[in-house]
Every structure is written in C-alpha cells, then in structure tokens.
C-alpha cells in the first residue's frame, strides 16, 4: 500500500462503458441531497431543491420517476432571504434536509425554506407522494439548518425526531433537539456550552437506550498553538424527559466524548465527515464505521481515513470518568469527586434531584476518548460519505464492504478482511465534472448503491463481475460479491447454488482455485494463455502490441518466447510493445502480469511474417487462436491502422 494507502485495483473513468451505471436526472431539478429508501426497498424517495421525488428502483437501469411534488419556499420568505443579503441564485430556496419515514402512510420532511426552516408531513398513497398543503407546513427551526451549506443530521426513533443542526441564521448556534411524538421537546442548553459554536453534525445513530450523535467542533479541553478541531460522539437517552425546573425542556442525559481515529505515531484524522452503523446479530459487537479527514494537509494533499468503533467501547467510555472545567484556570481536568445518583447519562427512569441535575449540567465531557480501529487510510482523496454492508463469501465467511464517496465525484468500493486493513476493489468516477458525492444510499434488495449529486442520482450496481474475463482476474479481484463459474466460464454475482464456483477471499490466489484443485497438478508459477492473438508483420512498419492493464495492483512485463524483455528496453512504450519487423522477430509475445505473487499472461500474441511463417509451439497446440490486426506505424511516416478490437485501459 505504501504511503498513499491502498490503490484501487480497477479504475473506471467517467463514461467508461465497462462499468454498468445509470444516471437519473430531471430537467430543472438540482441538489439531490437527501435519500430515503422505502421499507420494501423498491422506492427511493429523494429530497432535492424545492421538490421531493419518488423513484421506482425495482428494475435495473435508470430509476423511473413515479411522481414528484414541488415544495418551494414561499415568495415572502424568498424576499426576506434576499433582503438579508443571501443569494437569490444559490441560497434562497427550499433545500430538503430531512426526509424520514414517519409511518406506513406518511413521510416527514424538513427544508431550509429560504433561511427560514420548515417541516411538513407528506402523505403517501401506494408509495406515491401527495401534494403538500401550505397550511400543513410547520416551523422547522432546530430540525433543518437555515443555510444549505451547514451540516445536519436527523433520525426518527419511536416516532420522535432526533436532529442535530444549526439553530440560527448566522450558523453560530448548534443544537441537538428532539421533536415529534408524545415526549416533551428537548434541546441542548446554550449557556452550558455543551456544544461549541461551530459544532457540525454528520450522523445520528440510535442504539438500545440512547441515540448517538456524531459531530466535530473546536476543542476546548486542549491547549494548542492553533485552533484544534476534534471529533465527538454525544449520547442522549431516549427516555429523557428534561428537568422540572432546572434543565426544563433541556436534555438531562447529554454526554459527549472524543473520537480518536489515528495511526500509531501519526497526527489524528480529527474531522469526522460521516458515520454509519453496521448492525450485528448481537448489538454488543455492532460497529460504527466513520469517515475522517485531517485539518493538517500532510505533504500538501488531503487524506482520509475510515475507522471502526465498537458500541461496547463507546458505552464503556460513557460509563467512565468525567472531565470538569475549573472556572478560575479555564482548564479541563479529570473529575475526582464522588459519584452522584442517578449518574448522568445513565437513562435511569426516576426523577432527578436538583443536586443530580446541577452535577449533570457541568459534567458532560468524558475523560477518556473512544479509540477507533483504522481500517483504511488513503492520501490524495477526501471521502465525504460512506455506506457499509456485510457480504458473505463462497465459504460462508462474512466481509465488510464499504462504499466511499469522494469530494471529486468518485466512488470507492473497499473490502475489509477479518482483522485486517481494507483493500480497494475499484474506483468509479461517477461525476464527469468532479462534483462531490452528496449522499449515498444502499439498496440491498436491488444490489445497488445510489449516489446523490447536485445534478442527479447515479445507480451503481454493487459489483461488476462480468468485467473480469478470466478465472484468474475474477479471483484476484477479491470482490466478495463475485465468483468464477467454471461451467459458464464467467465471473458472476454470487447467487443461491454456487457450489462449484471459485473464489479466494482470504488470499486472492488463483494458483489453486483456478486449476482443478491442489491435487490436480503441481502448482505452476505462470498460467498458460487462454487465447492467442495471431498478428502478421507488415514490411517497413512498426507493430504495436497493446497490453490492457487490467489491474493497478499488478506489475507488467513482456516476454518473447521464454525470455523476458527488459523494462529499460526502448521497445516498450506506455505498456505496449513496439516491434520493427526483422529477422527473429516472430514467435510468442506475452504481456505478463504479476499480482499477489501470481503471474499470468494478460495477452498473448503469435507474431508471424507473411514470407516466413513460423510453426506454432506444440505446447500451445490446444489454445484457441484468433487473427487480429494491431496498430501499425509505417516507417518513414504514415497513418496508423485502426485495430479491429479496442484494448481498453482501466
């Protein structure tokens, strides 16, 4: 992996037809920011600028618009917004920021509403959206941000909306709030400084008794020579009802702790960008996967990391010691006093005494931090969003698969082997304009990931098995969704009956898997070609033998017969071999890839001259052959001949 982090094995450029993708866009619509999957997995609800859409995603291909309802900010609010020096072109609109499934018949949506947040219930009829009635629009302060650029998060739990956003026009008043449902509305307290003014929320994840909020903010507990940002997890109890007078309508169970995502001895990745929960059969082993960047640009480039945090570790830190602020010195130190009962954040049902509440309001910062396991560290890339799922390999083993959206509009598919660092199966450049990925939504039933952009939504099938044309390539890819079917001789998506299929997730070693098994024949260092391309030399012309680089992880060399052609040789240019017809030029040329300790011919050419045909090596007698034309350059200047087949670069 080197200092750069793992390289994607395969890279698809924007518009590359080898990666099956489809793009939904709608004339006049922009900012497809908020994505919600219906319970049955067949409809994708989308919050865009001034509109909510229902897309049918049941069938492969481009999502089909079921219907769309407009929800523009009122003219009065737009006028007020412009009067307050905000832009009519980019800001004074209703950007949908919250879209959750409230019950079987209603969605709940909130938007910026031209810097005057608003929320509404949207009725569903057979998964179609019914129009929004103006008199049903409510104040959305504390649920949606005012400014579309402000980060925010919201999650609906037991009919209550837990939201983290900016609560004022200036964007200097962060708030964690609970609304809807029968419980009292609760929020964070301004004066108690539970949140720094620049707190930026990225995720809200419910657990058994609590809801966790993930955010970043300026750190107040460290003396640092520059402003230091820090990532946090906060918790509030679902059964919190606020205080009777002290902390009335305020959280009485708010606690926060530092999240640490760092490689040993390195500066931490201190800015959290997104987090998701991957549930496990037992909640205690469930893990939260989070994407981080760093405020420090090492070597002038942005870098990102994905860390995993166990719920058990988070719970343990919240059960540990507190920090407290010494107001005389403005220093945070470990609290060493006696415990109060009930303990802050313990979610005990009884009413809290004023003494306990007084303690709570000042003891909200935990002493220990939650340490994450770095799974992927990559420089030169800024991850913005992630989606995570578990995939079962052929052998029944479970693999964590992460889909990572970047700030330049690409999607990385990463696989985390058990107790090991992640590797990148592929990188897909979705946006031709390098626009950032705004949101990701996994649709497991459809076997796809949906990526929201400013201009539309990409549907990305979770795997692209058919691109691996040989057993070797299929196995080396180590994509848990793909395996080699020896019968059809295709790399295919894993499905029900796959007994004789081939896959090696642990080692990615085709040496055993792609032969008939370990007992069949002694392992060979290099596999034989699957196809030989026959090429005729043309007098006074340079032959160009292309070599498709199927994997960025392989090293490539050319061989002639049994001899390796030196890399320094001027005959290799951009991976292609250039041949000038002369005596001894004929015979077998192979472009050989070496990956994961295994060598295999990517392409094999038999070069023949019209006047001196060569007898084919008897060892290659059973290998199928195909006559091809390759690009030629006439010596002394002349046009290149187009190849009959294109050799696409990854």
């Amino acid at each position: 992996t080197g200092g750069q982090g793992p390289m994607p094995r395969v890279k698809y450029h924007a518009g590359d037809g080898h990666r099956a993708l489809s793009f939904f866009q709608q004339k006049g619509l922009r900012d497809f920011d908020t994505l919600l999957l219906s319970d049955d997995g067949n409809t994708l609800y989308v919050g865009a600028r001034e509109a909510v859409l229902a897309l049918n995603i049941q069938n492969p291909g481009i999502p089909r618009l079921k219907n769309m309802i407009p929800w523009p900010a009122s003219e009065r609010k737009k006028t007020e917004c412009a009067f307050k020096k905000k832009s009519n072109e980019t800001q004074c609109f209703n950007f949908i920021r919250v879209l959750v499934s409230y019950n079987a018949t209603h969605l709940y949506a909130c938007g910026t509403f031209a810097f005057s947040p608003a929320c509404t219930f949207i009725e569903l009829q057979d998964s179609l959206l019914l129009p929004i009635l103006i008199d049903k629009v409510m104040d959305g302060k504390g649920q949606s941000p005012f400014d579309p650029v402000h980060k925010h998060t919201a999650v609906l739990v037991d009919g209550m909306l837990y939201s983290g956003t900016m609560n004022n026009f200036l964007g200097s008043e962060p708030i964690l709030m609970r609304t809807l449902g029968s419980q009292p509305v609760l929020k964070t307290d301004i004066f108690l400084r539970w949140l720094h003014a620049d707190a930026s929320f990225v995720a809200a994840i419910p657990s058994t008794q609590v809801v966790y909020f993930f955010f970043e903010e300026t750190a107040s507990e460290f003396d640092f020579f520059e402003e230091l940002y820090i990532s946090r997890v906060a918790q509030v109890c679902k059964n919190d009802v606020g205080g009777e007078k002290l902390l009335q309508k305020k959280w009485t169970t708010f606690l926060k702790a530092q999240l640490l995502c760092a490689q040993p001895g390195q500066l931490p990745f201190n800015i959290i960008r997104h987090a998701v929960l991957l549930p496990a059969d037992s909640p205690s082993v469930s893990r939260i996967y989070a994407v981080f960047t760093s405020q420090w640009q090492v070597g002038g480039t942005r870098s990102s990391a994905v860390c995993a945090f166990s719920l058990t570790d988070i719970e343990r830190v919240f059960k540990g010691k507190y920090k407290e602020l010494n107001k005389e010195t403005s220093r945070w130190t470990t609290y060493r006093g006696s415990e109060v009962s009930p303990r802050p954040g313990s979610c005990s049902m009884g009413p809290s005494s004023d003494k306990a509440l007084t303690f709570m309001k000042d003891h909200f910062l935990m002493d220990e931090h939650v340490v994450g396991t770095p799974l992927l560290v990559k420089s030169g890339v800024e991850y913005t969003r992630l989606a995570v799922e578990s995939a079962r390999g052929l052998d029944g083993s479970s693999h964590v698969v992460m889909y990572l959206g970047t700030s330049t509009g690409s999607l990385h598919k990463a696989v985390v082997p058990q107790d090991s660092s992640a590797y990148l199966v592929e990188e897909i450049q979705l946006s031709p304009d390098s626009e950032p990925v705004r949101n990701l939504q996994l649709a497991p039933a459809q076997g796809a990931v949906f990526a929201g952009f400013s201009g539309g939504i990409w549907r990305v099938p979770r795997a692209n098995c058919s691109v691996y044309e040989s057993c070797v390539d299929c196995v080396l890819a180590r994509d848990p969704h793909c395996a080699w079917d020896p019968e059809s001789r295709l790399c295919s998506l894993l499905s029900g009956s796959t007994k004789p299929w081939k896959q090696d997730m642990e080692r990615g070693n085709p040496e055993w898997v792609c032969t008939r098994g370990p007992m069949a024949r002694s392992p060979r260092r290099q596999s034989p070609p699957q196809l030989i391309k026959e090429v005729l030399t043309v007098p006074n012309s340079i032959l160009e033998l292309p070599c498709p680089h199927l994997s960025a992880l392989a090293s490539y060399h050319w061989s002639h017969g049994r001899a390796k052609i030196s890399e320094a040789s001027a005959t290799v240019y951009n991976g292609s071999l250039l041949l000038l017809p002369q005596d001894g030029v004929g015979g077998l040329y192979q472009c050989v890839a070496t990956e994961n300790g295994y060598s295999y011919p990517v392409v094999s050419y038999w070069v023949d001259s019209q006047d001196q045909p060569l007898a084919l090596d008897p060892e290659l007698a059973g290998v199928p052959r195909e006559r091809v034309q390759v690009p030629l350059t006439r010596v002394g200047g002349g046009a290149s001949m187009a190849a009959q087949r294109s050799y696409w670069p990854h």
Epitope: S172, F191, H196, S220, Q248, K327, T329
Partner: antibody, heavy 121, light 111 residues
C-alpha cells in the same frame, strides 16, 4: 474584587461607526459569558446578546442580530460592542454584565457602570 | 415572542411592605428561573434576587422572591421599606430560545 469597567461616553453622528469596550478583572474572564444590555432614555432594559470570551462564541437577541457585532479579546480581558453605521435610535446607555453561576443557573451578577452613546446630527 | 409584564409603578410608605408582580405571556412562569434587578436613579442595575428566591450576599433579608403558579406570576416582596429602596425594579427570565427577557420595569416610590 470582580468588576467590569466600561469605556467612556460617546457622541457620534448618524452613519458613523463605533466600538465600545468592557474590561473584566478580578475573575477568570475567559470562563464566564458577558452580556450587553441596552437602556434607551427613560425606558427599560433590553437584552442585546452575549459572548463567551474563551472562544468568542457570540449569541444575539432577536432584535439585535445583524444590527451590532459583539466580540472579545481574551488576551486583554475585554469585550466589545460595535456598530458599523449608527442611527439616532441607537442613542442609549449600554451596560455590560457578567453572566454568573447561580446555584442552578445563570443570572447577571456583576454589572458595568454603563456607556452613554448619543447619536445626533 | 415571550414577554414579562410588570406594573409600571407602585408606591408605599416607609416601614411598610410592597410586592411587585411579574407575569409571563405564555407557558408557565414557574418553568424557568426568574431574577430581579434593582436600578437606582443614575446607576447601573444590581441583582437583588436570583433563581426565584435566592438572595446574593449583601442584599438585606427584607428582600424576598417567590413564584405563584396559580396566577402564573413571580413576585418581589420588600418589607420594612426604606427610602433607599426607591428605584426601578426589573424581573428577568428566558424564552424558549434561551434569550434573556426583561420585564418592562416597575418604578417604586417610597412616600
């Protein structure tokens, strides 16, 4: 002892800018909110906003957002209230006050003596 | 927006007891703490009661505060009135957005 010392009276013309100050002493200035309160001639007290000098986190009352700027310089234990373009209606006495810890919550426990600002053409 | 209403003026003779009320416009006044400030003519305000009924040190025990949930109002009571008590008195609480709100003030005249 704990005290807040405010800058002296100002006479200004409409359209001019102004920055008045409030210097804290006798306590850890960075650990307490400082609020600003307006009192127009013969009228009551109006809450303008607050600042936490430790990190300059400022919050404004609804009527004053966008009208004034509250800032602080923690290195010299001073909070400021600033106008970019004064109006005649800004004529008032401006008090700074510390938001102190009660047993349970906050109240304005220490007040400055006030700065009289007169805006007249 | 949340408002606190006080009587514009009250007057009483020295040695007597006076009560100044402060009522909230919406919701229960008891749900938030109420503080009271005294402002003598030409001076800055000072705190006489905080958190409904707490007295800062140095404030005589003639000053007391209370909350009456039935009338949804807070009260400042001054017993044994002295001429030096002549001042404007302001109640203060917080609205739903944690903004401080002052009552309009009550002018106390000691006859």
């Amino acid at each position: 002892q704990v005290q807040l010392v405010q800058s002296g009276a100002e006479v200004k013309k409409p359209g001019e800018s102004l920055k008045i100050s409030c210097k804290g002493s006798g306590y850890s200035f960075t650990s307490y909110w400082v609020g600003w309160v307006r009192q127009m001639p013969g009228k009551g007290l109006e809450w303008m906003g607050i600042i936490y000098p430790g990190d300059s986190d400022a919050r404004y009352g609804p009527s004053f957002q966008g009208q004034v700027t509250i800032s602080a310089d923690k290195s010299i234990n001073t909070a400021y209230l600033q106008w970019n373009s004064l109006k005649a209606s800004d004529t008032a006495t401006y008090y700074c006050a510390r938001l102190g810890d009660g047993a349970y919550y906050y109240y304005l426990d220490v007040w400055g003596r006030g700065t009289m600002v007169t805006v007249s053409s | 927006s949340y408002e606190l209403t006080q009587p514009p003026s009250v007057s009483e003779s020295p040695g007597r007891t006076v009560t100044i009320s402060c009522s909230g416009s919406s919701g229960s006044i008891a749900s938030n703490f109420v503080h009271w400030y005294q402002q003598r003519p030409g001076s800055a305000p000072t705190t006489v009661i905080y958190e409904d009924d707490q007295r800062p040190s140095g404030v005589p025990d003639r000053f007391s505060g209370s909350i009456d949930s039935s009338s949804n109002s807070a009260s400042l009571t001054i017993s044994g009135l002295k001429t030096e008590d002549e001042a404007d008195y302001y109640c203060q609480s917080y609205d739903n957005n944690d903004h401080a709100v002052f009552g309009g003030g009550t002018k106390l005249t000691v006859l």
